[in-house]
């Protein structure tokens, strides 16, 4: 048994059919010694008296929030939550495994450039009793700063017949250089309580391996004369590292129809422009990639090709 | 501790095009590495990331884009001294911070070529002959250091008497491989913006 | 499986005029770019236009214009290549070549030899 | 026009060698660079597309890199079917253009 926050106790089980459990001894907090006695929950049943009550935890029934009483006045809470263990495994229920870019992906982090700034975001398709709590470190020998807000709910989707939730948080590396070469990972650690069910969830990374950038900002087209080629240009977003001569994007440029079967003009370029063909009821795309160390390209950034 | 603004004029920056192909030769070497040794351990996550040039050169600090150099967690107080001649300065404006990145680059170069080339060695001596370094990496590195044209003693090649680890040595490959990757990526986004300078 | 069938050799004299075509089948024909390259015997290979089937828009290089006209039939599945005023130096394997992509060729007709001799 | 040169014209190799072709563009064309495959009497085939992107059904021996001008594509255990000429293409502008070719012969 460990303290997750003040009067918040999580019980480690192994759970497997017959299991015996864990002994647990609550202490009542306060300075009087006699006519002491426990409830658990909403429950008036008395489970015990004094100022210790010694409990067998085997499931969910024996956890949740015990209260030491005396004369009709409460003295303390002690609030208990299993996180289970099965087969040697620490449960996953809680959040949904997104399978990307690996199994067993639970937590997800991007960055939009390197000043130490990520956000992290899960998913999960429990939509009430559910807290999350967020705490990262870079390094976890000799740990360094890093400042996470509250995890918020970002996002409800319809998949299927169930609804799913995601959550996400921001963090920020409390002295980042952007030009530093990572030799320790950050590591994101994520408490996730549902009901009197606890879990913990990690991930690890550098930033340079979660880069995406934002898609490129401002695109514009310029039809070249006695030609059916354009000229597109675009710039580099703005929430892109600076120096851009540092900090240097590549880019794809695509001229795509509607449907993805359909035919495409494509080329990479590492200039803020490019000559492309386009085609009626076509648009043209372009992305962006870090150009020296690739990590993930941005999202499309599109005009249409009339 | 950080590069001016006058700088090379551009085209006139012959090392942006090897610091190019240096990126390239490292990346290709390493996914080489990843591929052939997928029972090492030898991801980005699975090996320890160590930096042989720590504590001996400065080269982060000592390129740091001007712009970056307002922001205090960029500047750390190590302080080297070097060489200061390099035909990589093709301007009478080239300041002495310049000097200073780019001979902390040829010593990272220079450090990195002398493992590399001990590492060769031993892997030569594997029955299995399961990876040698890239003679292309090697001439790449070369070519780099060449135009960069410092003049630095020569740091003799190290010599192991005691049989070699294969196993140890491969995994060594592997770390050095992954922190030089990142190294020259630094290299690149240094060259990359000397030449826009 | 996606193919391009080309007709067959054609000899011609100096100055004359020659069609060769290429039959599409296994794929959508306005789905695909079509592109024509040449080479000359024993020479490397040379761009010369191309035709998006689905509107007949064309580019060709420089080198060319005004010496070769592609067209294509969707009712066939057929492209076609036109020179005009050939000369020996004309004389070439033509390839047509196709691929939902502009730039690079990712299916090949088995080419056609146009040679050009009075 | 941006010109493409090759190099070597010709190389002679024996069945495993491992075979490094070149491609150097005359201006920057950044990955927009393919390279095919011909034989005596055959038509082209694709075997690389934007510099180092595979081609499904192309054996994993071939491989390319590059960025820039400058370009490789490699044969790590060169086998009996790849004897042949080789060609990089760009696509970073029109007119699309060629390398001249380098030809892949039995030692």
């Known amino acids: 048994i460990w303290e997750l926050k003040k009067d918040v106790y999580v019980v480690e089980l192994d759970w497997y059919p017959d299991a015996p459990g864990e002994m647990v001894v609550l202490t009542c907090d306060t300075p009087e010694e006699d006519g002491i006695t426990w409830t658990l929950d909403q429950s008036s049943e008395v489970l015990g008296s004094g100022k210790t009550l010694t409990i067998q935890v085997k499931e969910f029934g024996d956890a949740g929030q015990y209260t030491c009483h005396k004369g009709g006045e409460v003295l303390s809470h002690s609030l208990l939550l299993l996180h289970k263990k099965e087969d040697g495994i620490w449960s996953t229920d809680i959040l949904k495994d997104q399978k990307e870019p690996k199994n067993k992906t639970f937590l997800r982090c991007e960055a939009k450039n390197y000043s130490g700034r990520f956000t992290c975001w899960w998913l999960t398709t429990i939509s009430t009793d559910l807290t999350f709590s967020v705490k990262s470190s870079r390094g976890s020998s000799d740990p360094q700063g890093v400042t996470c807000g509250a995890a918020t709910l970002s996002a409800e989707r319809v998949r299927g017949d169930n609804k799913e939730y995601e959550y996400s948080v921001e963090c920020q590396e409390d002295s980042a250089c952007p030009a530093a070469e990572e030799s320790l990972p950050i590591e994101v650690m994520v408490d996730a309580v549902h009901k009197l069910k606890y879990e913990n969830y990690t991930s690890s990374f550098f930033i340079r391996d979660i880069i995406k950038p934002d898609p490129p900002k401002n695109l514009q087209l310029k039809p070249l004369k006695n030609s059916r080629q354009v000229e597109v240009s675009w710039e580099y977003p703005d929430t892109w590292s600076t120096p851009h001569s540092y900090f240097s994007l590549t880019f794809c440029v695509q001229v795509q129809g509607k449907s993805k079967r359909e035919k495409k003009d494509r080329v990479f370029t590492d200039k803020t422009s490019a000559t492309v063909i386009c085609r009626k009821n076509a648009s043209i795309s372009v992305r962006a990639q870090d150009r020296y160390y690739s990590s993930s390209w941005s999202e499309w950034a599109s005009v249409p090709c009339s | 501790r950080n590069l001016p603004v006058a700088t090379p004029d551009p085209g006139m920056f012959p090392c942006l095009h090897h610091s190019q192909n240096l990126l390239r030769a490292v990346s290709n070497m390493l996914q080489k590495a990843r591929q052939t040794l997928e029972f090492y351990p030898c991801t980005s996550e699975e090996i320890d990331h160590e930096d042989i040039t720590k504590d001996k050169t400065s080269t982060v600090e000592a390129c740091l884009p001007l712009e970056l150099t307002k922001n205090e967690s960029c500047l750390n107080s190590r302080e080297t001294s070097f060489i200061t001649n390099g035909s990589c300065l093709a301007s009478r404006k080239t300041s002495f911070m310049m000097a200073l990145c780019l001979s902390s680059i040829y010593e990272d170069l220079k450090m990195y070529q002398v493992e590399f080339k001990t590492m060769n060695a031993k892997l030569l001596m594997d029955p299995k002959r399961q990876i040698f370094l890239d003679q292309n990496m090697l001439a790449v590195i070369d070519e780099l250091m060449q135009a960069l044209n410092f003049n630095s003693e020569t740091v003799p090649q190290k010599s192991s008497l005691e049989e070699p680890d294969f196993y140890k040595t491969k995994i060594k490959l592997c770390i050095l491989l992954h922190a030089f990757r990142i190294r020259a990526v630094t290299i690149d986004r240094v060259m990359s913006y000397l030449n826009a300078s | 499986e996606v193919q391009l069938v080309q007709s067959g050799a054609e000899v011609k004299k100096p100055g004359a005029t020659v069609k060769i075509s290429c039959k599409a089948s296994?794929?959508?024909?306005?789905?695909?770019?079509l592109h024509w390259v040449r080479q000359a015997p024993g020479k490397g290979l040379e761009w010369m236009g191309w035709?998006?089937?689905?509107?007949?828009?064309?580019e060709y290089a420089p080198k060319f214009q005004g010496k070769v006209t592609i067209t294509a039939d969707t009712s066939t599945d057929t492209g076609y290549l036109e020179l005009s005023s050939l000369r020996s130096e004309d004389t070439a394997v033509y390839y047509c070549?196709?691929?939902?992509?502009?730039?690079?060729?990712?299916?090949w007709g088995q080419g056609t030899l146009v040679t050009v001799s009075s | 026009d941006i010109q493409m040169t090759q190099s070597p014209s010709s190389v002679s190799a024996s069945v495993g060698d491992r075979v490094t072709i070149t491609c150097r563009a005359s201006?920057?064309?950044?990955?927009?660079l393919h390279w095919y495959q011909q034989k005596p009497g055959k038509a082209p085939k694709l075997l690389i597309k934007?510099?180092?992107q595979s081609i499904s059904g192309v054996p994993s021996r071939f491989s390319g890199s590059g960025s820039g001008t400058d370009f490789s594509l490699t044969i790590n255990s060169l086998q009996p079917e790849d004897f042949a000429t080789y060609y990089c293409?760009?696509?970073?502008?029109?007119?699309?253009?060629f390398g001249g070719g380098t030809k892949v012969e039995i030692k």
């Open positions: 070549a196709a691929n939902k992509e502009l730039r690079y060729f990712d299916v």
């Open positions: 296994g794929y959508t024909f306005s789905d695909y770019y």
């Open positions: 035709i998006d089937p689905e509107n007949g828009d064309t």
């Open positions: 201006q920057s064309i950044s990955i927009n």
């Open positions: 934007f510099a180092s």
């Open positions: 293409q760009q696509s970073n502008s029109f007119p699309l253009t």
